[in-house]
């Protein structure tokens, strides 16, 4: 068992844990920019999925000590286009390497305040946090 | 505010919320099998990323009312190989469509038990839960 500071309200509150809920996505620390490196813009024939992909990416750490999970990783695309399946290095302009985003549920540790405003341990504030999961090789969107 | 049954311990306990911690990943409800549909094994020129991808996938809902988040989605690949960038329909055997997995932090609501074993509200049990995020077009692994 591991102990957490209580979210328990003082007497007079309903016997419930307060969990704030917001559907407003929290932006990541940095914009999930593309990060093109011609040297690493290649699809490997071994190694992890993100290096074997024809839309390769790297992961960038986003750490917040008052958030659960404390460590999140944002994908950063290494190429603007997809890498050729044949060569593993030349880019194919017919395919775009696009970031796949996801609004992940996270929890922030916040001070809780009792009825009279006095500090009552910590509460967990539930938020949606936008993370880029991977880079995906897609056909460019054709506008109608 | 959103309310959850309390993690508040009874008198005599430290004024802390108990949170169990396990690093053992929880398997998803169903194995993340491949789900090949020749009819949907094509890369669209519009629509969401998962349908424009040359490794298209669909999402399958995994709902657990005693878990946070309650709803998780598992990617299911629609093709064994990548779809040709040129045609958007024919498969290219030089590329494999592979699932990208991630161990996501989730929380389970569990009954808490007091000193004498009596029920004392709920605790949050933190677990790692394996989810498939997307299907990625990769170069097949070449064994050394």
């Amino acid at each position: 068992y591991s102990h957490w500071p209580s979210c328990c309200p003082s007497k007079g509150y309903p016997s419930e844990e307060l969990l704030r809920w917001s559907t407003v996505p929290v932006p990541p620390l940095k914009p999930a920019s593309l990060d093109f490196h011609s040297v690493s813009c290649r699809a490997s024939e071994d190694g992890p999925l993100n290096s074997r992909a024809i839309s390769p990416w790297r992961y960038e750490l986003d750490r917040d000590l008052n958030r659960l999970p404390q460590d999140l990783y944002h994908a950063r695309c290494l190429c603007p286009h997809c890498v050729s399946l044949q060569t593993g290095s030349h880019m194919d302009p017919r395919g775009n390497s696009e970031l796949l985003y996801h609004n992940q549920t996270v929890f922030y540790r916040r001070p809780c305040h009792g009825k009279k405003g006095n500090h009552k341990g910590y509460c967990l504030e539930r938020r949606l946090y936008r993370v880029s999961l991977a880079c995906v090789c897609v056909r460019p969107r054709v506008m109608g | 505010y959103s309310h959850w049954p309390s993690c508040c311990p009874s008198k005599g306990y430290p004024s802390e919320e108990l949170l169990r911690w396990s690093t053992v990943p929880v398997p998803p409800l169903k194995p993340a099998s491949l789900d090949f549909h020749s009819v949907s094994c094509r890369a669209s020129e519009d629509g969401p990323l998962n349908s424009r991808a040359i490794s298209p996938w669909r999402y399958e809902l995994d709902r657990d009312l005693n878990r946070l988040p309650q709803d998780l989605y598992h990617a299911r690949c629609l093709c064994p190989h990548c779809v040709s960038l040129q045609t958007g329909s024919h498969m290219d055997p030089r590329g494999n469509s592979e699932l990208l997995y991630h161990n996501q932090t989730v929380f389970y609501r569990r009954p808490c038990h007091g000193k004498k074993g009596n029920h004392k509200g709920y605790c949050l049990e933190r677990r790692l839960y394996r989810v498939s995020l997307a299907c990625v077009c990769v170069r097949p692994r070449v064994m050394g």
Epitope: S2, P48, S51, L68, Y73 | R126
Partner: antibody, heavy 125, light 107 residues
Framework: QVQLVQSGAEVKKPGASVKVSCKAS????????MNWVRQAHGKNLEWMGL????????SHKQKFQGRVTMTVDKSISTAYMELSRLRSDDTAVYYC??????????????????WGQGTLVTVSS | DIQMTQSPSSLSASVGDRVTITCQAS??????LNWYQQKPDGTIKLLIY???TLHTGVPSRFSGSGSGTDYTLTISSLQPEDIATYYC?????????FGGGTKLEIK
Amino acid sequence: QVQLVQSGAEVKKPGASVKVSCKASGYSFTGYTMNWVRQAHGKNLEWMGLINPDNGGTSHKQKFQGRVTMTVDKSISTAYMELSRLRSDDTAVYYCAREGYYGPSPFHHYAMDYWGQGTLVTVSS
Amino acid sequence: DIQMTQSPSSLSASVGDRVTITCQASQDISNYLNWYQQKPDGTIKLLIYYTSTLHTGVPSRFSGSGSGTDYTLTISSLQPEDIATYYCQQYSKLPYTFGGGTKLEIK
């Protein structure tokens, strides 16, 4: 016991690249982040970046953007730090340091709990 | 980036003395502070993490305190083997940053 053993001293010309290795033993290599810190002669410690050996995830100081590449080889429990386009002011001792996590789960605290012996990199024409 | 200012930059004390080193952050770092010891041969060891928790094997004469932006490392009774340079480091936010160091000498 935990040990981090670094590669030997290097002498490089300006514009060249250097790759320093750090072999870990005595613990689960993929379970701990590895930091890279440098120290120019008579100067203070400067954090360069870190890498998670499990997924290759990194973070680095902005001033090293585009010049530093941190990698790992899980099969031999070794971390690498490559610095390119070397300048004379990159002359320093380069350290790898394991990042331990402490305190009440799930809100951890982080500290560089074990350090390599350091690798002197001299950049000179 | 968070700036860490350490003082004094050097100090000389006698064996048995009580020694205090201070570290000031450019913003509140919520006790997310570590202290390290660098011996003259370059060897670096973790002394204290999270402001005041002693790392395994560190003698109890070392202690840490502080909050907000101001932190202190104290050696209650200086020993000859404590000759070293001491650094504070914040881990409140990436990038991590170190103080300028305090070189401790024996009189």
